[in-house]
């Protein structure tokens, strides 16, 4: 297992609709053809694999399970979007990148993006 640098923004504010997007960029030492990206949430004394995707370079990301994430890739960048977030989902979201093929296997873990989620205020009752 070889180390690899992964960069991601320090802070992101989710939209009022509970959507947060950020870029995860990795310094690929070689010509990887198969890449796995995992988003980890570190908060509340827990570490959770929020979503994971495997993709072949140049192709769409295929997320596993009932994913709340979507994403696209471009070169050594992955644009990740997490949906359905609420205030309680505020936390540190870490990007983990694995170069699966061809060998050697590379692993990179970012420092994390602190995602802040603010629940929208309910609209006041209207007479109209």
């Amino acid at each position: 297992c070889k180390a690899m640098h992964v960069a991601q923004p320090a802070v992101v504010l989710a939209s009022s609709r509970g959507i947060a997007s950020f870029v995860c960029e990795y310094a690929s030492p070689g010509k990887a053809t198969e890449v796995r990206v995992t988003v980890l949430r570190q908060a509340d004394s827990q570490v959770t694999e929020v979503c994971a995707a495997t993709y072949m370079m140049g192709n769409e990301l295929t997320f596993l399970d009932d994913s709340i994430c979507t994403g696209t890739s471009s070169g050594n960048q992955v644009n990740l979007t997490i949906q359905g977030l609420r205030a309680m989902d505020t936390g540190l979201y870490i990007c983990k990148v694995e170069l699966m093929y061809p060998p050697p296997y590379y692993l990179g873990i970012g420092n994390g993006t602190q995602i802040y989620v603010i629940d929208p205020e309910p609209c006041p009752d209207s007479d109209f």
Partner: nanobody, 125 residues
Framework: EVQLVESGGGLVQTGGSLRLSCAAS????????MGWFRQAPGKDREFVAA????????SYADSVKGRFTISRDNAKKMAYLQMNSLKLEDTAVYYC??????????????????WGQGTQVTVSS
């Protein structure tokens, strides 16, 4: 709901290992996120680990990360908790639980509506 029965608990020395099993019956097992919780004497029940419906995504409490591994076999309707490097503070009754919901950011707070009867794990020095 599903019916859950745990097994595999027992007495083990510090640094030892145990594998807990959770057998499910009833509804479609693969529709449920599975979790393990524990309760030590005089303490509240706490989250240990959870696993997504297909088994691809996992969540762990910081206190067990790197020592415990959660897994599942949907064909056998089983969930497992492999516990290594056990510590005295791991002594508790361990419960498996099922939540009929997809994965998310906070599996510890999912609406677990099915619970097993628990299995005792005792770690001694």
């Amino acid at each position: 709901e599903v019916q859950l029965v745990e097994s595999g608990g027992g007495l083990v020395q510090t640094g030892g290992s145990l594998r807990l099993s959770c057998a499910a019956s009833g509804r479609t097992f693969s529709n449920y996120t599975m979790g393990w919780f524990r309760q030590a004497p005089g303490k509240d029940r706490e989250f240990v680990a959870a696993i997504s419906r297909s088994g691809n995504l996992k969540s762990y409490a910081d206190s067990v990360k790197g020592r415990f591994t959660i897994s599942r076999d949907n064909a056998k309707k089983m969930a497992y908790l492999q516990m290594n490097s056990l510590k005295l503070e791991d002594t508790a009754v361990y419960y498996c639980a099922a939540a009929p919901v997809p994965w998310g950011t906070r599996p510890s707070t999912f609406p677990y509506d099915s619970w097993g009867q628990g299995t005792q794990v005792t770690v001694s020095s």
